[in-house]
């Protein structure tokens, strides 16, 4: 008799999930020789152990602690780039500006980027059919808890000037419900972090508005200031030119505002 399976509202586990996690771990350790001490099979076992045989609405940060321990990594605390709703540009930036890091430039972030996963209570099976949706089903699902855990740790590690890239094309440039707004902002350590500098990325070619005056940016400034961290904001009017100037800073056109 086929066993009844819980139907969730979100997409199921990404196909080839175990193979992808293991392969990414191996790639990461090849690309980053300083992480060669990591045993990728153990990393996969710890990742699997966090959600397999557990109810996918009952996952805790504690479940991910063995994985967090194995993936412990030191990144320069003053070279952290946070982002919200503008992942691709943030990653293009750190590809060029090699000394800066997004969460996805760390081992744990790289392993899970763009993947979905969940298991089922009391069975060792991975659910490839459906996984809980954060809004429609539950917030304590394997994917959400993972990102909350790694994002908190990443923000806690930050020091000096922390940068955040924000999407100026969205109605809420700063969204309190995003991972940045709900987790990272509240876990920056005022005794270590001096300034949060927001880079507001413009979408329109002819958009010359000062988006640093947007009400949601003012809200971010207020939250940050209350936490005894200074706040600054810059408009990036031309993201394409911005990236080009990061690549070639000596270019004569790079002295003007971007």
């Amino acid at each position: 008799v086929p066993r009844w399976r819980q139907q969730w509202s979100g997409p199921g586990t990404t196909k080839r999930f175990p193979e992808t996690v293991l392969a990414r771990c191996v790639k990461y350790t090849e690309i980053h020789p300083e992480m060669r001490h990591v045993d990728c099979q153990s990393v996969w076992d710890a990742f699997k152990g966090a959600f397999i045989s557990k109810h996918p609405c009952n996952i805790t940060e504690e479940d991910y602690q063995p994985l967090m321990k194995l993936g412990t990594q030191t990144v320069p605390c003053n070279k952290i780039l946070l982002w919200s709703r503008i992942k691709d540009l943030a990653h293009q930036f750190t590809q060029v500006q090699r000394d800066m890091f997004t969460l996805e430039d760390t081992l744990l972030g790289y392993l899970a980027d763009d993947l979905t996963w969940c298991g089922e209570f009391n069975t060792s099976k991975i659910n490839y059919q459906s996984c809980p949706d954060w809004r429609k089903d539950c917030s304590n699902n394997p994917v959400s808890v993972f990102w909350k855990t790694v994002s908190r740790r990443f923000a806690e590690a930050a020091c000096d000037v922390v940068h955040v890239m924000l999407n100026g094309s969205r109605s809420k440039i700063f969204d309190k419900n995003s991972t940045f707004g709900s987790v990272e902002v509240h876990n920056l350590q005022p005794e270590k972090v001096q300034t949060l500098e927001a880079w507001v990325i413009h979408g329109g070619r002819e958009d010359s508005r000062d988006l640093c005056q947007d009400p949601t940016i003012k809200e971010l400034e207020s939250i940050i200031s209350k936490r005894n961290i200074q706040f600054s904001c810059k408009n990036i009017y031309r993201p394409d030119k911005f990236l080009q100037c990061v690549k070639n800073p000596e270019d004569s056109s790079c002295t003007s505002e971007i």
Epitope: V26, P33, R36
Partner: antibody, heavy 120, light 107 residues
């Protein structure tokens, strides 16, 4: 079985560019970093750079920084290495190579090589 | 960049001889050294990875040792098919670097 098949020999003029391809088969292309290594006639091997085919992220040896572009086409499971501003010293055999899980970080898998001859 | 110095550059030996090739790194590379065999017109073949691990299918007469800055490839009893050029490579630090090669010729 696992194969890396490279494009054919090229003869190029000084100052021009060459683009060498490496088509992967027998494994999931995005699961392995692809490296490029070259060897001038009678010389040692020289690592040029890598690409992570999943994201397109690359790293190129300082020596080639301004002249080498490594790209990939995921749909074709193919990696490319383009070398510009060619000079006579770029006459060499160019190889793509990759590692294998559980075999350290050496290259057990190599393409057959592509001969690039640069003439004035 | 890390320099790898291989010695000797040339080596004349007879079938049955024991052959030793050394590779010295300009700084510590732990055990992240691999050895390759290359024959004319062919791609290199991986023999030894992580200093001392024989790759699948490589005959037992090939062995590797060393760690830190000094590494050795030994062929216990040279066979006719072993006449080739041998390279060490370090993968401990980017960029990867290769030794200058050791050509093993028939005496």
């Amino acid at each position: 079985q696992m194969q890396l098949v490279q494009s054919g020999a090229e003869v190029k003029k000084t100052g021009s560019s060459v683009k060498v391809s490496c088509k992967a088969s027998g494994y999931t292309f995005t699961d392995s970093v692809m490296n490029w290594v070259r060897q001038a006639p009678g010389q040692a091997l020289e690592w040029m750079g890598w690409i992570d085919p999943e994201y397109g992220r690359t790293d190129v040896a300082q020596k080639f920084q301004d002249r080498v572009t490594i790209t990939r086409d995921r749909s074709m499971s193919t990696a490319y290495m383009e070398l510009s501003s060619l000079r006579s010293e770029d006459t060499a055999m160019y190889y793509c190579a990759r590692t294998k899980y559980n075999s350290g970080y050496g290259f057990p898998y190599w393409g057959q090589g592509t001969t690039v001859t640069v003439s004035s | 960049d890390i320099q790898l110095t291989q010695s000797p550059s040339f080596l004349s030996a007879s079938v049955g001889d024991r052959v030793t090739i050394t590779c010295k790194a300009s700084q510590n590379v732990d055990s992240d050294v691999d050895w390759y065999q290359q024959k004319p017109g062919k791609a290199p073949k991986l023999l030894i990875y992580k200093a001392s691990n024989r790759y699948t299918g490589v005959p037992s007469r090939f062995s590797g040792s060393g760690s830190g800055t000094e590494f050795t490839l030994t062929i216990s009893s040279l066979q006719p098919e072993d006449f080739a050029t041998y390279y060490c490579m370090q993968s401990n630090t980017h960029p990867r670097t290769f030794g200058g090669g050791t050509k093993v010729e028939i005496k």
